[in-house]
Interface confidence: low
């Protein structure tokens, strides 16, 4: 996850160890049936478990294990590089029976001048170079091949694209004598897609370009370009869709204005304005045409770029995103929150909710957190009783049925899920808040009290009477 955080989500459980599962013995022909389960209703969890168990039982005599890991492939075209000139790459786990491909763009902030890129290279080198990347990665959350952890798309071909361009996946400039660093985020995506066509992507039915944080913004910036690329290369039948997690930022007024000295404190508009020039950043063509030259920075903000996109995009965004609060200079440390800051935070949630009003496919819980889709517990959070995997399944169905002219939402299968309660953690399924310094789980009631909410407001959704809450707090708990 990105940047400096004051409150952290509950520690992620380690992914389960890879299971010993039967697979076809080497050299045997494998007959694959590209089934499409998009429109399956009912209990998806048990259905998927049954399907997987059936698939496994087809090869009872094999000794080979099914590997759950994604394997590293550095780009064959070594001119498409990370910041330091090392080749970019991707991690892949193929699922030969599936015509679904999930390409995930990693996040990790950005740097926008020589000084803060040098500092980033010293402290976060794996986000600027492929030299020390591990040979394999375990797929978690939406990248997991376990139906228990990923009831949505466990059977898809999984691709994790590490972020090593520091440019919000927008850059198109190579390393030279003049440029100490290469910024090739947009080109890396294009090259990965090109190489994957030779590894089975050519037979895909659906390509879902997903990403978290800077990767989520990267989805908004690149999804139409990927669709256009596939069309030009002769694959117009591949449906390209986007899933942008925690990358829908507001160019709002900071709580306290600070000069643009580093990545974290620089106002997002100013950071992106400077970044675009430094990276030779590219934005979606239809969005670029809406703004004057020099104003392309606008296209990095979801609510401005989204209406110009042609591909369907599902937006996932915490209403109180930690990265948003960080760039707005909100640091919830030490002293209890003043009234002005409490109102600022509440207003942020309100503004974000407003920007999602016309985004038909969206999932926005009223939580203070950052990123969700590759967390092992991504299935836990609900909005109005619907989990994110369920909402994504409903989205798939709505797109599957969209050729039937009907624009009415599917009964009992919602895709627009935005919390309406107005303060952080008023949704009972929010991830636990943790204190950055002690790592201890914070009592949500205490956390909200610290943020200046009145007793009744805080006590109710936590399942406490105000008197009980007072007692708990006065007992020093």
């Amino acid at each position: 996850s990105e940047g400096r955080k004051t409150w952290r989500r509950r520690g992620q459980q380690p992914p389960p160890p890879p299971r010993t599962e039967a697979a076809p013995a080497a050299g045997q022909p494998v007959e694959s049936f590209p089934l499409d389960f998009t429109a399956v209703e009912g209990n998806m969890d048990s259905f998927m478990a049954q399907v997987k168990s059936l698939a496994q039982s087809l090869y009872p005599c094999s000794a080979q294990q099914l590997n759950e890991d994604l394997r590293l492939h550095l780009l064959l075209n070594t001119s498409v590089t990370c910041n330091d000139g090392s080749p970019a790459g991707y991690y892949l786990k193929e699922s030969r029976g599936s015509r679904r491909w999930l390409l995930f763009l990693e996040g990790g902030w950005y740097c926008f001048n020589r000084e803060n890129c040098d500092s980033r290279y010293d402290t976060m080198r794996r986000l600027m170079s492929s030299r020390d990347w591990p040979r394999t990665r375990t797929g978690t959350g939406i990248l997991s091949s376990q139906p228990e952890e990923n009831p949505y798309w466990w059977n898809a071909n999984m691709v994790f694209i590490p972020y090593c361009s520091s440019d919000v996946w927008s850059g198109a400039s190579s390393k030279s004598e003049k440029n100490e660093y290469a910024f090739m985020g947009a080109l890396i995506i294009q090259e990965v897609v090109r190489e994957l066509l030779g590894r089975g992507l050519s037979g895909a039915k659906v390509l879902l370009l997903a990403g978290s944080a800077a990767g989520g913004t990267g989805v908004l910036l690149n999804v139409d370009r990927v669709a256009e690329q596939l069309e030009k290369l002769g694959y117009p039948a591949i449906q390209v869709r986007g899933l942008a997690d925690s990358g829908w930022f507001l160019d709002n007024k900071q709580y306290r204005h600070t000069d643009c000295v580093d990545t974290i404190t620089c106002a997002p508009t100013e950071a992106i304005r400077r970044g675009i020039r430094y990276w030779n950043g590219v934005v979606p063509e239809r969005c670029r045409r809406q703004f004057q030259e020099g104003e392309e920075w606008n296209c990095f903000f979801g609510y401005k770029v989204y209406p110009t996109l042609r591909c369907p995009v599902f937006v996932v965004q915490w209403l109180f995103d930690e990265a948003q609060l960080t760039v707005d200079n909100v640091h919830l440390t030490g002293q209890p929150v003043q009234e002005g800051l409490r109102l600022y935070i509440q207003n942020l949630g309100r503004e974000l909710r407003h920007t999602l009003k016309d985004v038909p496919a969206s999932f926005a819980p009223a939580c203070l957190s950052h990123e969700i889709i590759i967390r092992s517990h991504w299935t836990d959070v609900q909005v109005k009783g619907t989990s994110l995997p369920r909402a994504l399944h409903c989205w798939d169905r709505s797109l599957h049925d969209s050729h039937k002219a009907s624009k009415t939402p599917l009964k009992g299968c919602p895709v627009h899920l935005v919390d309406s309660c107005p303060w952080p953690h008023c949704n009972p399924s929010c991830p636990t808040v943790r204190d950055q310094f002690t790592g201890q789980e914070m009592n949500v009631a205490q956390f909200l009290m610290h943020m200046g909410f009145d007793m009744q407001t805080v006590a109710q959704p936590q399942g406490l009477e105000p008197s009980e809450l007072l007692g708990m707090l006065s007992n020093g708990s």
Epitope: Q13, C421, P428, T432, E441, L464
Partner: antibody
Framework: EVQLVESGGDLVKPGGSLKLSCAAS????????MHWLRQAPEKGLEWVAY????????SYANTMKGRFTISRDNAKKTLSLQMTSLRSEDTAIYYC????????????WGTGTTVTVSS | DIVLTQSPASLVVSLGQRATISCRAS??????????MHWYQQKPGQPPKLLIY???NLESGVPARFSGSGSGTDFTLNIHPVEEGDATTYYC?????????FGSGTKLEIK
């Protein structure tokens, strides 16, 4: 496999003391609030006590306040319930249960340990 | 404390038919669009097992024959179609305020 196993149940005289333990495995114990609940013979379920993940919040049923103490050791993945001044009405199967952080329900239960208070 | 009144205390249902169990709270257990009511099944000699959480959400691994509904003070657990193995006791529980409390249980028999 996610598991909770209670131990320490015994036959004890009224006014006596007993310490119950609950060993957790298969999940990150330190992430979860934990509860003790009980069920008297042929009766319904009754909540006993709660402890938050970092032991910052402790809460007890009214009839057990002052007599029972809930504690945990996250490093050892154990939950404890120290019971004193036991009464015959404390006779029950005692269960430890994990509180799901999505709204206060009990998503994992132990198999239970039997406490009998009788002279 | 919030009192949960479960009804009926016992219920006889034919195999394959629908079983409906009610739970009424002495005050609302809903807040901000969420209902803090949960349902458990308990077989003799075993601990309770979570079936439904937050009023209507099916716990992972629980058959879709089980469903929950309701908000405010009135909640329902439905089992349809009923199977032999469903013959046991069911409890509702709220987590709206401390202490959490349980209903007195409903014993389901299959004929």
């Amino acid at each position: 496999e996610v598991q909770l196993v209670e131990s320490g149940g015994d036959l004890v005289k009224p006014g006596g003391s007993l310490k119950l333990s609950c060993a957790a495995s298969g999940f990150t114990f330190s992430d979860y609030g934990m509860h003790w609940l009980r069920q008297a013979p042929e009766k319904g379920l009754e909540w006993v006590a709660y402890i938050s993940s970092g032991s910052t919040t402790l809460s007890y049923a009214n009839t057990m306040k002052g007599r029972f103490t809930i504690s945990r050791d996250n490093a050892k993945k154990t939950l404890s319930l120290q019971m004193t001044s036991l009464r015959s009405e404390d006779t029950a199967i005692y269960y430890c249960a994990r509180k799901n952080y999505n709204g206060g329900y009990f998503d994992v239960w132990g198999t239970g340990t039997t406490v009998t208070v009788s002279s | 404390d919030i009192v949960l009144t479960q009804s009926p205390a016992s219920l006889v249902v034919s195999l394959g038919q629908r079983a409906t169990i009610s739970c009424r709270a002495s005050k609302s257990v809903s807040e901000s669009g969420y209902s803090y009511m949960h349902w458990y099944q308990q077989k003799p000699g075993q601990p309770p097992k979570l079936l439904i959480y937050l009023a209507s959400n099916l716990e992972s691994g629980v058959p879709a024959r089980f469903s929950g509904s309701g908000s405010g003070t009135d909640f329902t657990l439905n089992i349809h179609p009923v199977e032999e193995g469903d013959a046991t006791t069911y409890y509702c529980q709220h987590s709206r305020v401390l202490p959490p409390t349980f209903g007195s249980g409903t014993k389901l028999e299959i004929k």
